[in-house]
């Protein structure tokens, strides 16, 4: 994300296209304050960052409310009034969409679909995994909206699953995070559970009429 | 592929106000904001204003008092009003979608085709 | 607001030749400029930006420089078909500006 200026690694999050977080790693300057300076136009003249992130009492990074305008951050990383890294970027290349919001699950015999409130921004793929404690690893289907079905699930079985969303890579680029997963939750026949137990539970036999 | 679709009147009269339609695909408009540019006759291109991907406005402050930039994102739709057209409004007007680069240096890579708008009573 | 001169309205070359069009913007805009293609009846195509990057599917022969204040749009190997019109347009400080265009006739 970011070359090196005198040793300077950047990371840039741009959360929910609403919050930015701009975080350095300036091994040379590793017992040193860095200040950061950034404007939103390219002709304004730069302030100085108000909430700094703080790494082992030094700063190491600042988050900041965006201007919802052209998307482009002008910032300066300086030692004293001398800079060490200067550049711009289109935040929007490093889009972390937020985490899932009010998740329902609507079964319907062998399949269940997964709903959640939708961005309010597009181009995203809204992606569930899941599994059963048989299962050695999660299964993913994902689509453009949230409104997710996944059909040929065993109604005896506990399954877990949890949500995400992702940016497509060919509109946004590779640069971009995926949201945090929501949290997981459990079901059986229909039901909630508090957890699928972590190794299957044997088929009850079946009594004969 | 990306593609600005432009409808609206050839001909409107002294006065009168100017709305034109600019439908996009292959592109959301809530990601990317929409500029409008005109080109009069023998004047040039003339930068009109820009509707942000958040719903915000800017204007070129010549226009400020007769320009209205609105859009409706689930149709794709950007609008454009001008009011009190006079003859030296007589213009091309087009809409256009920025391509940003990852250091925010950007350009005006897809332009609709343009609306041919004449004012004369 | 920034003007931006292209103090040449009209411009002769023939086909193979070199031609360099100039603009010159009325405060320091950095390197944030465009340069654009118009054909009549077309609408304008992109040729470079930031001053000297090229956009996307652009010959070559067309190449930008400048900084500053003066700016520079050179066309190498002039081709029948670049007769047009070329715009400089900066995009430091809103509202954006475009230079009056020079007219290129290929004889």
């Known amino acids: 994300q970011g070359g090196a200026a005198e040793g300077v690694q950047i990371q840039i999050i741009y959360f929910n296209l609403e919050t930015v977080q701009v975080t350095w790693n300036a091994s040379k300057y590793s017992r040193t304050n860095l200040t950061f300076h950034y404007r939103f136009n390219g002709d304004e003249a730069y302030d100085q960052c108000t909430n700094y992130l703080l790494q082992e009492g030094h700063t190491s990074g600042c988050l900041l409310d965006a201007e919802q305008r052209d998307d482009i951050l002008y910032f300066s990383i300086r030692n004293g009034t001398h800079p060490v890294f200067t550049a711009s970027r289109w935040m929007v290349y490093y889009l972390k969409p937020s985490s899932p919001k009010h998740v329902r699950f609507s079964w319907h015999q062998d399949a269940v679909t997964v709903t959640c409130s939708d961005l309010s921004y597009g181009d995203l793929l809204y992606e569930v995994q899941y599994r059963s404690p048989f299962d050695t690893e999660w299964q993913s289907k994902q689509e453009n909206t949230c409104n997710v079905t996944i059909e040929g699930l065993d109604a005896e079985k506990c399954y877990s699953f949890w949500v995400r969303v992702k940016a497509m890579e060919d509109v946004y680029g590779p640069d971009t995070y995926p949201s945090d997963w929501s949290e997981v939750t459990c079901w059986q026949r229909g039901e909630i559970r508090d957890a699928c137990a972590e190794t299957p539970t044997p088929p009850k036999p079946k009594l004969s009429k | 592929q990306v593609q600005l679709k432009q409808s609206g009147p050839g001909l409107v009269q002294p006065s009168q106000s100017l709305s034109i339609t600019c439908t996009v695909s292959?592109?959301?408009?809530?990601?990317?904001?929409l500029h409008w540019v005109r080109q009069s006759p023998g004047k040039g291109l003339e930068w009109l204003g820009v509707?942000?991907?958040?719903?915000?406005?800017d204007y070129n402050a010549a226009f400020m008092s007769r320009l209205r930039i609105t859009k409706d994102n689930s149709k794709s739709q950007v609008f454009f009003k001008m009011d009190s057209l006079q003859a030296d409004d007589t213009a091309i007007y087009y809409c256009?979608?920025?391509?940003?680069?990852?250091?925010?240096?950007?350009?005006?890579?897809?332009w609709g085709a343009g609306t041919t708008v004449t004012v004369s009573s | 607001d920034i003007v931006m001169t292209q103090s040449q309205k009209f411009m002769s070359t023939s086909v193979g030749d070199r031609v360099s069009v100039t603009c010159k913007a009325s405060?320091?805009?950095?390197?944030?400029v465009a340069w654009y293609q118009k054909k009549s009846g077309q609408s304008p195509k992109p040729l470079i930006y930031?001053?000297?990057s090229h956009c996307s599917e652009v010959p070559d022969r067309f190449t930008g420089s400048g900084s500053g204040t003066d700016f520079t749009l050179t066309i190498n190997n002039v081709q029948s078909e670049d007769l047009a019109e070329y715009f400089c347009?900066?995009?430091?400080?809103?509202?954006?500006?475009f230079g009056t265009g020079t007219k290129l006739e290929v004889r």
């Open positions: 405060q320091n805009v950095g390197t944030n």
């Open positions: 292959g592109f959301s408009l809530t990601i990317y904001g």
């Open positions: 930031s001053a000297s």
């Open positions: 509707i942000w991907r958040g719903g915000s406005t």
């Open positions: 256009a979608k920025p391509y940003y680069d990852y250091d925010g240096n950007w350009y005006f890579d897809v």
């Open positions: 347009q900066q995009y430091n400080r809103y509202p954006l500006t």
